[in-house]
Structures are given as C-alpha cells and as structure tokens.
C-alpha cells in the first residue's frame, strides 16, 4: 500500500470523525455520546489503516483536551471503551439510545 493511499484514508477517516462529533452536537440527545464515539471510530477504521490511525490520533487529542478542561475520569473511560469498540469493527448500534432519530 502506498503512502498516498494511507494519507487518503486518514483524510477520509478524519472527516468521518468530524461528522460523528458534529452529529453528536446537533442531536444533543441524552445517552448518545458512546454511540457517536463508536460510530465515528467505526466509520474511520473501515477506510483502512490510515482511517484507523486518524481515528486514534483524533480521539487521543480529544481526550487530552477534555482532561485538561476537567472532564471526569469515569466519562473518559466510557468514551475510550466506545472508541475502541468502533475501531475494532464492532457494531456501533450496540450503544444506540432508544429513539435516536434515524438520520444519525
């Protein structure tokens, strides 16, 4: 695999992650955080190694920023578990809250 295809996957993966985070903000639905974390990572990882790499870099950066701003350790662990769940190819719908609109 070429460096350029890895880069392309990373770019698409970053876009998947961005879309999941922006959907999460738009939905503003109690109990949906883990679903969106899993979905973003799942979609990115499906792109290939570059996508999985981008997902990991973005989630790590996000965790560090949240930690800096005092995000709870328990919430952080739950988010990490959901990130890893999606990145490993498991169905994000496992975390889907009842009634979350289908557009998400």
């Amino acid at each position: 695999r070429s460096f350029f295809s890895f880069l392309g996957e990373a770019f698409d993966g970053a876009r998947d992650m961005w879309r999941a985070y922006s959907d999460m903000r738009e939905a503003n639905y109690i109990g949906s955080d883990k679903y969106f974390h899993a979905r973003g990572n799942y979609d990115a990882a499906k792109r290939g190694p570059g996508g999985a790499w981008a997902a990991e870099v973005i989630t790590d950066a996000r965790e560090n920023i949240q930690r800096f701003f005092g995000h709870g350790a328990e919430d952080s662990l739950a988010d990490q578990a959901a990130n890893e769940w999606g990145r490993s190819g498991k169905d994000p719908n496992h975390f889907r809250p009842a009634g979350l609109p289908e557009k998400y």
């Epitope: 719908n93 975390f95 889907r96 009842a98 009634g99």
Partner: antibody, heavy 121, light 107 residues
Framework: QVQLQQSGAELVRPGVSVKISCKGS????????MHWVKQSHAKSLEWIGV????????SYNQKFKGKATMTEDKSSSTVYMELARLTSEDSAIYYC??????????????WGQGTLVTVSA | DIQMTQSPASLSASVGETVTITCRAS??????LAWYQQKQGKSPQLLVY???TLAEGVPSRFSGSGSGTQFSLKINSLQPEDFGSYYC?????????FGTGTKLELK
Amino acid sequence: QVQLQQSGAELVRPGVSVKISCKGSGYTFTDYAMHWVKQSHAKSLEWIGVINTYYGDASYNQKFKGKATMTEDKSSSTVYMELARLTSEDSAIYYCARGSSIMITSWFAYWGQGTLVTVSA
Amino acid sequence: DIQMTQSPASLSASVGETVTITCRASENIYSYLAWYQQKQGKSPQLLVYNAKTLAEGVPSRFSGSGSGTQFSLKINSLQPEDFGSYYCQHHYGTPLTFGTGTKLELK
C-alpha cells in the same frame, strides 16, 4: 418492586386499529426504555420496537414500521402501542418489557403479563 | 438481521437429569446473549444475560456459556418447575432477535 401492568384482552375486527397500554411502577419510569414483544404460534417471540421514556421517541424493527406506533405518558408512567390495519396475522400476545437501560440493545428482566389481541370477523 | 437458531426444538427429560440447550447466531454477537424460561400461559422470565451472568434469583443449577456464534444453557439436576419453553435472545445490535425456542418436556 418493579411491576408492569398491561391492559386487558382485545377482540377486534380486521382493518381496524387497537391501542394497548403498559403501566410501569416501582422504579424511575424515565430511566429505562420500554420495549414491546410479539408472541404468536407461527413466529415465537419477535421484537417490535422500543420507546425512549425520557424523550418519547421510538425506534422500530423495520418489519413493524407502519404497523406499530409507540407513545408514552410520563405523568402516569404509561406506554402505549397502537397496532393499525389489523389482520389475522396480528393475532398474538403482546408483551411490554422494561429494558436494562435507555439503550436499544437490552435484555429483559421485567415483563408485563401480556395482552392477547384476537383479530376476527 | 441476526438469526438465532436453537436446538433441539424439543426434548424430553426426567427430574434429576442434566440437559443442555444450544443457540447459534448467524454472525458474531460476542457475549451479548440472554436466555429466558417461559411456562405455559406466563410471561418469559430472564435466566441469563451477557451469555453467562445469572439473573437475580435464578437457581445455580442454571448456567450459560459460549461466545461468538455458539452458546449453550445447561440445567443440572432438573427440577419439576424447570419444564417449559426456553428462548435465547441477542442483545448486540438492532433489531433484537429471539431464538426459535426449545420445549423441555417431562419424560
């Protein structure tokens, strides 16, 4: 203790609609999703869908979209399911079951006693 | 949709015997499986969730095992109250689906 009390049996004509209810007690109603399950001789147990008791939004099994509509009334801790355009295929026992959380994916530790719906001309 | 297939469809056994019911998922559901018992004219009752966690109040003669696509429910030393129907159900993705059922009858 947790209890789910369902409405009584219904005998209805083909083509009409029926609305059945399930009242939850003994727990915080909006903390758990409520699911509906159909049991018929032909198909054993089938998951119809689930309602988010906090928001009142429902998620349905594709197979039951257009057939079932779920609603809730927080003030009475009651969920409802309306079944439309009934046919003999809809004759079954319908159970409400409390989810293990607000997620769709769930096991069911608490079930209502079931509501028998019979569709007959 | 994930298909859940149980075997056998029915079995006869005597009090005191040990029986095993199996459930096969059409795709990997990891350990997200529940088992229920249902007696004639009654609602199903949860026995096991997460493949092997016994629900509250369930006797220890019941045990669940398996992961991935193959699961089983074992009942040691059958008691008269254990006869009835048994169903498995996955709680992994959507839609949730139940097994075809196993009827356990007294020999």
